[in-house]
Interface confidence: low
Amino acid sequence: GITIPRNPGCPNSEDKNFPRTVMVNLNIHNRNTNTNPKRSSDYYNRSTSPWNLHRNEDPERYPSVIWEAKCRHLGCINADGNVDYHMNSVPIQQEILVLRREPPHCPNSFRLEKILVSVGCTCVTPIVHHVA
Amino acid sequence: GITIPRNPGCPNSEDKNFPRTVMVNLNIHNRNTNTNPKRSSDYYNRSTSPWNLHRNEDPERYPSVIWEAKCRHLGCINADGNVDYHMNSVPIQQEILVLRREPPHCPNSFRLEKILVSVGCTCVTPIVHHVA
């Protein structure tokens, strides 16, 4: 593993254990400066496995609003614009980190939490189980 | 709107401003208990817009390892297993929150950072620009 020399200007911490409590500045820095602002803006509609986005709000979580993708069809849209059930629309899921207020309702104390979110959908060939 | 009463057992904070510095417990709680561990494990191969996963490692970031999807083809795989260039494979991107060590190399001090990651690929109908 990489050993990083400790910066002498770091805030002091008495906490020697991991897992540990750390200080986090909530002033979000955006690294996405070079991205195309349109990026995946209309893929949800143009995809052969289109999806809708549903709003999930939780005031005890940071960020409080997360958008979840739900595939519109079991099958995929074919060249004629019809649903082809020989293919499957499936959600692409990702584990993301969020902050959960702990103890509950505390404005300045959080715990890292890992949640699974569906980001969009893709069209896959189904797994066919042959009966012997 | 809902006003959440403040828990009297909250850690004290002198910081009245938002954005602000908060305490975060890095002992990650995993909410994904009921999910199928296989979930989208083989979608990257079975998709009509297949992708490869590339490892992005940064010791100054938490989590230090993030996997980035790169679409294998410009087009999509058709029923014959060939690439159809009348359709486009495109990355589905999501903005996620990560922790960035700040000041650098400090073990107990972070800043929230927003980064854009490609999670997988989907097959879309291309936008055709007609020349007048």
Epitope: L26, I28, N30, N32, T33, P37, K38, R39, S40, S41, D42, Y44, N52, L53, H54, R55, E57, P59, Y62, P63, S64, V65, W67 | G1, I2, F18, E95, L97, K114
Partner: nanobody, 123 residues
Framework: QVQLVESGGDLVQAGGSLRLSCSVS????????MGWFRQAPGKEREFVAA????????RYADSVKGRFTMSRDNAKKQVYLEMNSLKPEDTAVYYC????????????????WGQGTQVTVSS
């Protein structure tokens, strides 16, 4: 809960200008975006413009590109819509809402809508 209050709507002559404001409360942080939408009489609500809270990148409906400009003030938790060269077809009730950036999906998936602000453009 997210609460939204829109203001700044008025009656204006074609070719005139207006600045709409939207005040947001209850949204601790949005790593997403705010959008302006509008609903003309007898029509469905439609997307007008969006801005990312972090980064400030914007996008617009084709019908308003080059005429409308969206901006935000993170500290005040406010977003604005500067409307120039107004046309009679811009007449509608204008609403703001938080949204997934660039994804103008089904309107029923948004937070509860505010009262909106009426913009009327006379010819």
């Amino acid at each position: 809960q997210v609460q939204l209050v829109e203001s700044g709507g008025d009656l204006v002559q074609a070719g005139g200008s207006l600045r709409l404001s939207c005040s947001v409360s209850g949204l601790r942080v949005s790593s997403y975006a705010m959008g302006w939408f509008r609903q003309a009489p007898g029509k469905e609500r439609e997307f007008v413009a969006a801005i990312s809270w972090v980064g400030g990148d914007t996008r617009y409906a084709d019908s308003v590109k080059g005429r409308f400009t969206m901006s935000r003030d993170n500290a005040k938790k406010q977003v604005y819509l500067e409307m120039n060269s107004l046309k009679p077809e811009d007449t509608a009730v204008y609403y703001c809402n938080d949204m997934p950036y660039g994804m103008e999906t089904r309107m029923d998936d948004y937070a509860s809508w505010g009262q909106g602000t009426q913009v009327t453009v006379s010819s």
